[in-house]
């Protein structure tokens, strides 16, 4: 025998306290699937949380974070702080990226500057908390007499310093 | 699949105690350091306290210290968090995480799966 709730569609509950009608979800709460006895009630966004998408008789609410935060787990269960450019998240909070290293994001950790000697080339541009070192041509090709028909080596992207 | 199942969260009242459950799956537990992180609704994100993976360093945020003991039994692949003389402002989602190596620090901020969450509500 078919159970009757399985022609309850979504948006909808099998009521069993009047002969398993189909009724509809409450306000505040939703069904995404057919055949549901209960409807879910809907995620709330507050505080930190903002909401993306609203909730619907057939669809959970979608939060996101607020300007400053960045959303992290499935669904945007958490929101974690953005830092400035020359800062990385610690346990903590944001502290300044320590000499030698930078970061040019609102988030992830200081990277270390390019060591362009391994590269037989000089440093061009210093780094500095929020910018890698940009490397230049090799001292090499800067001694007097050299050829100056070398172009300069194109500067090396940040997020290729060895780790 | 890296999995952090997290249990145990409840409504409780202030200066009472709750103990927090995380049963970890898809990896070498033993083998990582692993963090409780809450959220309150109008926070951030913020590190509660942080265990080592053979257990024998713990960290703790300042706003918990002397209240929360963090403790893992990897035998059973399992994280735990004891929250004692609760207060109102540790009502949050609290958060399972796995750090990304072995050692740990009240530092460096190195997490890279979180768990779902359980809710903790501190209300009279």
């Known amino acids: 025998l078919q159970d009757p709730c399985s022609n309850c569609p979504a948006g909808t509950f099998c009521d069993n306290n009047r002969n398993q009608i189909c009724s509809p979800c409450p306000p505040n709460s939703f069904s995404s699937a057919g055949g549901q006895r209960t409807c879910d009630i809907c995620r709330q966004c507050k505080g930190v949380f903002r909401t993306r998408k609203e909730c619907s008789s057939t669809s959970n609410a979608e939060c996101d974070c607020t300007p400053g935060f960045h959303c992290l787990g499935a669904g945007c269960s958490m929101c974690e702080q953005d830092c400035k450019q020359g800062q990385e998240l610690t346990k903590k909070g944001c502290k300044d990226c320590c000499f030698g290293t930078f970061n040019d994001q609102k988030r992830g950790i200081c990277r270390p500057w390019t060591n362009c000697s391994l590269d037989g080339k000089s440093v061009l541009v210093n780094g500095t908390k929020e910018r890698d070192v940009v490397c230049g041509p090799s001292p090499a090709d800067l001694s007097p007499g050299a050829s100056s028909v070398t172009p300069p080596a194109p500067a090396r992207e940040p997020g290729h310093s060895p780790q | 699949e890296v999995q952090l199942v997290e249990s145990g969260g409840g409504v409780i009242q202030p200066g009472g105690s709750l103990r927090l459950s995380c049963e970890a799956s898809?990896?070498?537990?033993?083998?990582?350091?692993m963090s409780w992180v809450r959220q309150a609704p109008e926070k951030g994100l913020e590190w509660v306290s942080s265990i080592s993976g053979s257990g024998d360093s713990t960290y703790y945020a300042d706003s918990v210290k002397g209240r929360f003991t963090i403790s893992r039994d990897n035998s059973k692949n399992t994280l735990y968090l004891q929250m004692n003389s609760l207060r109102a402002e540790d009502t949050a989602g609290y958060h399972c995480?796995?750090?990304?190596?072995?050692?740990?620090?009240?530092?460096?901020?190195?997490?890279?799966?979180w768990g779902q969450g359980t809710s903790v509500t501190v209300s009279s």
């Open positions: 995480a796995k750090e990304g190596s072995n050692g740990t620090d009240d530092y460096h901020y190195d997490i890279d799966v």
């Open positions: 898809g990896f070498t537990f033993s083998s990582y350091a």
